[in-house]
Interface confidence: medium
């Protein structure tokens, strides 16, 4: 299977809401003893390798914010903790997941990573991620709502296999 | 039974380099990432480096990036820490050691060691 | 990078005696601190994860407990084998970082 991230930029006002996107592409197994772990995390852009590092989002780490369910199942993050950080992750039948993030800052911006691991027999057996940027922008030149740019299709980066 | 086994440590000049490896085996070596740990003489304990289980995404230590390069193939469950440059200051025993479970940074299986000696 | 600072460095303790160790964090790590004991001339092991996860095989006497910045490594009643060195370290986020250890000897 794949992750394909539906958008490599979103571009926000401060103050807006946002959802970043991924979504997993091809076939899924469903089997009673294969499940997925899918989170979310801050990264930075390495000179080789993207998603490699590990950071918080508003001080949620990728284990608060994780999803472990059962093939396309649909799954939420615990309300109480994430709408204290104005977060909520999710992911619905289809195989797309998402982090919503509430009332954007400038320090909001940075480089976010979708990662699914796919479990068997309580081994992390294929791991998939895909990147997007995030730029919240204040003043007279920033949009009045988000605006989201399309990925490449060429672009490696954003479409990782198993 | 899960077991890791490193070698390739040894005396060597500072400037010059090492290879080390580490063996695994008694579980699937792709799914879980592997990190290097050191232990200066009568010191505590440095992460040193780690490497994703599927993607060879690498990460380092301040101290070491630049000069080390961790590397793993999953053909042959090894897992590789190529140092260059060496110091005075990198005499440690590494350790190679499994992140435990899925996307964690907590270390649950560890290797027995190997010595390395950077001195003239 | 997270600081990890722990306390005492050392302590003297006869066996069947309650231990507690204590490693504060710099910065917040939720509750993502794991414990490791070092007997001289072994490789570290995991006792704890998560702050009070205890991994498969440790005995029960070992606890641990905290979040935030505070943690602690209790030993409820130490055994002949437990006198090692104790590591707290963080696995909150890259790089994971280490206390600088806890000699718990015999007194």
């Known amino acids: 299977f794949k992750v394909a991230t539906p958008y490599s930029l979103y571009v926000c006002p401060e103050g807006q809401n946002v959802t970043l996107t991924c979504r997993l592409l091809g076939p899924v197994d469903k089997g009673h003893d294969v499940t997925f772990y899918k989170t979310w995390y801050r990264s930075s852009r390495g000179e080789v390798q993207t998603c490699s590092e590990r950071r918080p989002i508003r001080n949620l780490t990728f284990q608060d914010l994780h999803l472990h369910h059962g093939g396309h199942q649909a799954a939420n993050t615990s309300h109480d903790l994430a709408q204290r950080h104005g977060l909520e992750s999710a992911s619905d039948h289809h195989g797309n997941f998402s982090i919503t993030m509430r009332n954007l800052t400038l320090l909001d911006s940075g480089l976010y990573c979708c990662l699914v691991v796919e479990i068997r027999h309580h081994h992390s057996e294929h791991r998939v991620h895909g990147a997007m940027e995030l730029q919240v922008q204040t003043g007279k030149d920033a949009p009045s709502n988000c605006v989201v740019y399309p990925s490449s299709s060429q672009d490696s980066e954003n479409i990782t296999a198993a | 039974e899960v077991q890791l086994v490193e070698s390739g440590g040894g005396l060597v000049q500072p400037g010059g380099s090492l290879r080390l490896s580490c063996a695994a085996s008694?579980?699937?070596?792709?799914?879980?990432?592997m990190s290097w740990v050191r232990q200066a003489p009568g010191t505590g304990l440095e992460w040193v480096s780690g490497?994703?289980?599927?993607?060879?995404?690498?990460f380092y230590a301040d101290s070491v990036k630049g000069r080390f390069t961790i590397s793993r193939d999953n053909s042959k469950n090894t897992l590789y820490l190529q140092m260059n440059s060496l110091r005075a200051e990198d005499t440690a025993v590494y350790y190679c050691?499994?992140?435990?479970?899925?996307?964690?940074?907590?270390?649950?299986?560890w290797g027995q060691g190997t010595l390395v000696t950077v001195s003239s | 990078d997270i600081q990890m600072t722990q306390s005492p460095s050392s302590l003297s303790a006869s066996v069947g005696d309650r231990v507690t160790i204590t490693c504060r964090a710099s910065?917040?790590?939720?509750?993502?601190l794991a414990w490791y004991q070092q007997k001289p001339g072994k490789a570290p092991k995991l006792l704890i994860y998560?702050?009070?996860s205890l991994q498969s095989g440790v005995p029960s006497r070992f606890s641990g407990s905290g979040s935030g910045t505070d943690f602690t490594l209790t030993i409820s009643s130490l055994q002949p084998e437990d006198f090692a060195t104790y590591y707290c370290?963080?696995?909150?986020?890259?790089?994971?970082?280490f206390g600088q250890g806890t000699k718990v000897e015999i007194k």
């Open positions: 910065q917040g790590i939720s509750s993502y």
């Open positions: 008694g579980y699937i070596f792709t799914g879980y990432d």
């Open positions: 490497i994703d289980g599927h993607f060879d995404s690498s």
């Open positions: 998560a702050a009070s």
């Open positions: 370290q963080q696995h909150y986020t890259t790089p994971p970082t």
């Open positions: 050691a499994r992140s435990s479970y899925a996307v964690d940074l907590a270390f649950d299986y």
